[in-house]
């Protein structure tokens, strides 16, 4: 029977800069029941605080609700593991909420095959930003990435869409059923999970175009950019 091993705070994430959660990995338990507590202070303070909510984020977590989340403040936190034989402390972790944002996936992904009479057919997709993110405040710039693949293919084809919430693709295999997903990330922060897959059947008479892909601006009727495969590769974010 031994004191507990050193825990490690391995991740902190915020969906929207208004709340955040941190998770830790326990060290060895020393063969005894072990209690964990997270304490923190803000940089510039010596007032020590305890985790306000050990429940919301699941096991080995601390959730900071709205009233505990301050923008422009760096949190200095550590986890204490205690059993009957003694205690051990994690290293201090410095957390600035601005840099730990991981949004929810984009919503309402719509995918359609467009076949205008006067132009080549294309795949058109549209989505909405996650509801927790308020883009109107100017706190956020969200960047989007799309991936798609034929249902039975192993490899995804990925396209960076910038800040647009609409996208066009010309190069597709006729007669194939495609899976399409979208994800987002703030300018400082982490990519969201991919949205649930949307399926689209490409008609057999869809005209193939391997040379170019077309990316539209916000308004499909507005200016459009023709982007080569080489340029597109330059925009990839993985």
């Amino acid at each position: 029977q031994l004191p507990p091993g050193k825990p490690e705070i391995f991740k902190c994430r915020s969906p929207n800069k208004e709340t955040f959660t941190c998770w830790w990995r326990p060290g060895t338990d020393g063969g005894l029941p072990t209690n964990y507590s997270l304490t923190y202070h803000r940089e510039g303070e010596t007032l020590m605080h305890e985790c306000p909510d050990y429940i919301t984020g699941g096991p080995n977590s601390c959730h900071f609700g709205k009233q505990y989340t301050s923008m422009w403040r760096t949190y200095v936190m550590m986890v204490n593991a205690t059993n009957q034989m003694g205690s051990s402390f994690s290293d201090e972790l410095y957390v600035d909420v601005t840099y730990i944002v991981q949004p929810d996936p984009p919503l309402e992904l719509t995918v359609e095959v467009k076949q205008p009479e006067d132009r080549k057919p294309y795949l058109w997709m549209k989505w909405s930003p996650p509801t927790l993110i308020d883009l109107k405040t100017g706190w956020f710039t969200l960047l989007y990435e799309i991936r798609l693949k034929p249902e039975k293919a192993a490899e995804w084809e990925t396209h960076f869409a910038g800040q647009q919430t609409e996208f066009k693709i010309l190069s597709l295999h006729p007669g194939q059923k495609y899976l399409v997903q979208v994800r987002c990330k703030p300018d400082h922060g982490y990519w969201s999970a991919w949205s649930p897959a949307t399926f689209i059947q490409i008609p057999s008479d869809f005209i193939m175009n391997d040379e170019q892909k077309l990316i539209s601006e916000e308004d499909l009727g507005g200016e459009q950019k023709l982007i080569s495969e080489e340029d597109l590769h330059h925009h990839h974010h993985h």
Epitope: T39, L47, H49, C51, P52, F64, S70
Partner: antibody, heavy 118, light 107 residues
Framework: EVQLVESGGGLVQPGGSLRLSCAAS????????MNWVRQAPGKGLEWISY????????YYADSIKGRFTIYRDNARNSLYLQMNSLRAEDTAIYYC???????????WGQGTMVTVSS | DIQMTQSPSSLSASVGDRVTITCRAS??????LAWYQQKPGKVPKLLIY???TLQSGVPSRFSGGGSGTDFTLTISSLQPEDVATYYC?????????FGGGTKVEIK
């Protein structure tokens, strides 16, 4: 409605003891850090004690250290102040106050009067 | 311990006047400073925190400023309902010291 209600004040002789209680309602008491602040008649506010949400961190003002004990019972949504070795200068209204997430006193009780006199 | 000194200890001004109260910390406290208002016979009420952030529901005639050691609370146009004692308080470390208070009266 978010509310703090103090009780337990009264007249006590110097050297005596008293226990103040603060009953919380309308919010998740166990998530908040709590404090006692007092105000002597005609005087200013004096912070005297702090307790973290689970009771693991406690601070006292020098004026009460070793004589007063702060503790809490989250199951009962209650905060307490055990006051021993009371002195005349401890005469005051005692307020319990909730510490918000940004460390300011956002909710106050109505106060309970403690008079130490022979 | 860090001391908080308020000045003046009392003041009298006319309705509509601009009133400024000063609070000085004996050491730098960044902007970990709050202002409270206590009306006669009432419980203290939070006005401002982080030196300049107005608490929800507080009239916009109240404003706070300063950082480090010197802070101010300003009432841009004094109203009869502003008669009260105003306290500054630092909250970056224990003890969570209050200033001595400034009593504001109407002429």
């Amino acid at each position: 409605e978010v509310q703090l209600v103090e009780s337990g004040g009264g007249l006590v002789q110097p050297g005596g003891s008293l226990r103040l209680s603060c009953a919380a309602s309308g919010f998740t008491f166990s998530s908040y850090e709590m404090n006692w602040v007092r105000q002597a008649p005609g005087k200013g506010l004096e912070w005297i004690s702090y307790i973290s949400s689970r009771g693991g961190t406690i601070y006292y003002a020098d004026s009460i250290k070793g004589r007063f004990t702060i503790y809490r019972d989250n199951a009962r949504n209650s905060l307490y102040l055990q006051m021993n070795s009371l002195r005349a200068e401890d005469t005051a209204i005692y307020y319990c106050a909730r510490l918000s997430g940004v460390d300011i006193f956002d909710i106050w009780g109505q106060g309970t009067m403690v008079t130490v006199s022979s | 311990d860090i001391q908080m000194t308020q000045s003046p200890s009392s003041l009298s001004a006319s309705v509509g006047d601009r009133v400024t109260i000063t609070c000085r910390a004996s050491q730098g406290i960044s902007n970990y400073l709050a202002w409270y208002q206590q009306k006669p016979g009432k419980v203290p009420k939070l006005l401002i925190y982080f030196a300049s952030t107005l608490q929800s529901g507080v009239p916009s005639r109240f404003s706070g400023g300063g950082s480090g050691t010197d802070f101010t609370l300003t009432i841009s146009s004094l109203q009869p309902e502003d008669v009260a004692t105003y306290y500054c308080q630092r909250y970056n470390s224990a003890p969570l010291t209050f200033g001595g208070g400034t009593k504001v009266e109407i002429k």
